[in-house]
């Protein structure tokens, strides 16, 4: 079998062999090495000599291969349009961001870039749950049986009905979607509004 | 050659202090993360502090923070470790670790051959 | 913090045997996984960087896959040299945090 071409090499149809990795250099009609993420070309490529890359510098970085000649520079995560920093920027990532808590993310170019408050649900609903946290709006959806919230708020989330029984005690008013049960001791007569129901 | 001397370890009573120096040749320290290692005898490895390549950024871990403090001097291609309050439970080798190709923390590439701290009464 | 839990945390193979060693973040961590070699009384070796790249000098048998937060190092034949402790380790964010190792241990 042939030997693997090694960068710089020619190239007359313009590809080459690992696009990830490599590059077409027109001027000479080569293939060159790209420099691995976290680094820059330093030195372009000849016929000659293959690319030379160096670290990117303090503050800045480079995701992937690349025949760029500088690296990016690192940007914080902006708490003015909502976003917190869940790791750093290194040379090899950009600052990882994510909305704040109890945000969610409004615009969205490659990244986010603005996130906004999430809405409120109203008693007897809660937020559905999603599988990723501040990727959209909340989206209310009713307590299921048997469960309540009593609040307007974007978190709360729906608690199941106080059992009576369970703390010794009898159920004085049903609990609804938004209100929990209410119970008193058995030995305690009915409230006055409650006395009409009661069985003489 | 590449290589990353560890030294400065030695026994010390608890309470105690001691400065661990890395000196590093053969790549540019002055554009690596650095790091400290350590692992008590037995055990395994334990993240314990680093700095970014200009020492902008400096990270320790909580079993150390507030006693430990990591600095560089790029002039002299070296990492240091100041530890004070030492502790028993600070005995271990302490390993220097670089990222030649990351100013900030990354996979460590490069490793001293560990200098030994024991702390005793 | 970001919890690394590695399994098994010893095995016993034969020269010629195929190991894998898991590792498992308890977030995800993208693809900031690194992988050591350690023999007793040495420092520790780079092995795979950014979870599947392997480090210059590192023999193809060895390989690492996975992202997000489930990983695996696979030697696809044990030599040896190669009985020693494996740990996996973290890069996403600090605290950095390892793995507890993996011994690889001649049956």
């Known amino acids: 079998s042939q030997p693997q071409a090694v960068p710089p090499y020619a190239s007359e149809n313009q590809t080459c062999r690992d696009q990830e990795k490599e590059y077409y250099e027109p001027q000479h009609r080569i293939c060159c090495s790209r420099c691995p993420p976290g680094t820059y070309v330093s030195a372009k490529c000849s016929r000659i000599r293959d690319t030379v890359c160096a670290t990117c510098a303090e503050n800045s970085y480079n995701e992937h291969w690349n025949y760029l000649t500088i690296c990016q520079l690192c940007r914080p995560c902006d708490p003015v349009m909502g976003l917190e920093e869940i790791a750093p920027c290194t040379s090899k990532r950009k600052t990882q961001c994510r909305c704040q808590p109890g945000m969610f993310c409004a615009a969205w170019a490659l990244e986010c870039t603005h996130c906004e408050l999430l809405s409120d649900c109203p008693p007897g609903t809660e937020a559905e749950l999603k599988d990723e946290v501040g990727k959209g709006n909340n989206h209310c959806v009713p307590c299921k049986a048997g469960h309540f919230q009593n609040t307007s708020s974007p978190s709360a989330r729906c608690q199941p009905h106080t059992r009576c029984e369970n703390q010794g005690l009898v159920e004085a008013a049903p609990g609804t979607a938004q209100s929990d049960t209410t119970c008193k001791n058995p030995l305690e007569p009915l409230p006055p509004e409650m006395s009409g129901t009661m069985l003489m | 050659e590449v290589q990353l001397v560890e030294s400065g370890g030695g026994l010390v009573k608890p309470g105690g202090s001691l400065r661990l120096s890395c000196a590093a040749s053969g790549f540019t320290f002055s554009t690596s993360g650095m790091n400290w290692v350590r692992q008590a005898p037995g055990k395994g490895l334990e993240w314990v502090s680093s700095?970014?390549?200009?020492?902008?950024?400096?990270y320790y871990a909580d079993s150390v923070k507030g006693r430990f403090t990591i600095s560089r001097d790029n002039a002299k291609n070296s990492l240091y470790l100041q530890m004070n309050s030492l502790r028993a439970e600070d005995t271990a080798v302490y390993y220097c670790?670089?990222?030649?190709?990351?100013?900030?923390?990354?996979?460590?590439?490069?490793w001293g051959q560990g200098t030994v701290v024991t702390v005793s009464s | 913090d970001i919890q690394m839990t590695q399994s098994p945390s010893s095995l016993s193979a034969s020269v010629g045997d195929r190991v894998t060693i898991t590792c498992r973040a308890s977030?995800?961590?993208?693809?900031?996984l690194n992988w050591y070699q350690q023999k007793p009384g040495k420092a520790p070796n780079l092995l795979i960087y950014a979870a599947s790249s392997l480090h210059s000098g590192v023999p193809s048998r060895f390989s690492g896959s996975g992202s997000g937060t489930d990983f695996t190092l696979t030697i696809s034949s044990l030599l040896p040299e190669d009985f020693a402790t494996y740990y996996c380790?973290?890069?996403?964010?600090?605290?950095?945090?390892f793995g507890g190792g993996t011994k690889v241990e001649i049956k």
């Open positions: 977030q995800s961590i993208s693809s900031d």
């Open positions: 380790q973290q890069s996403y964010n600090t605290p950095l945090t």
């Open positions: 700095v970014s390549s200009s020492g902008s950024y400096i």
């Open positions: 670790a670089g990222a030649r190709y990351n100013w900030h923390f990354d996979a460590s590439d490069i």
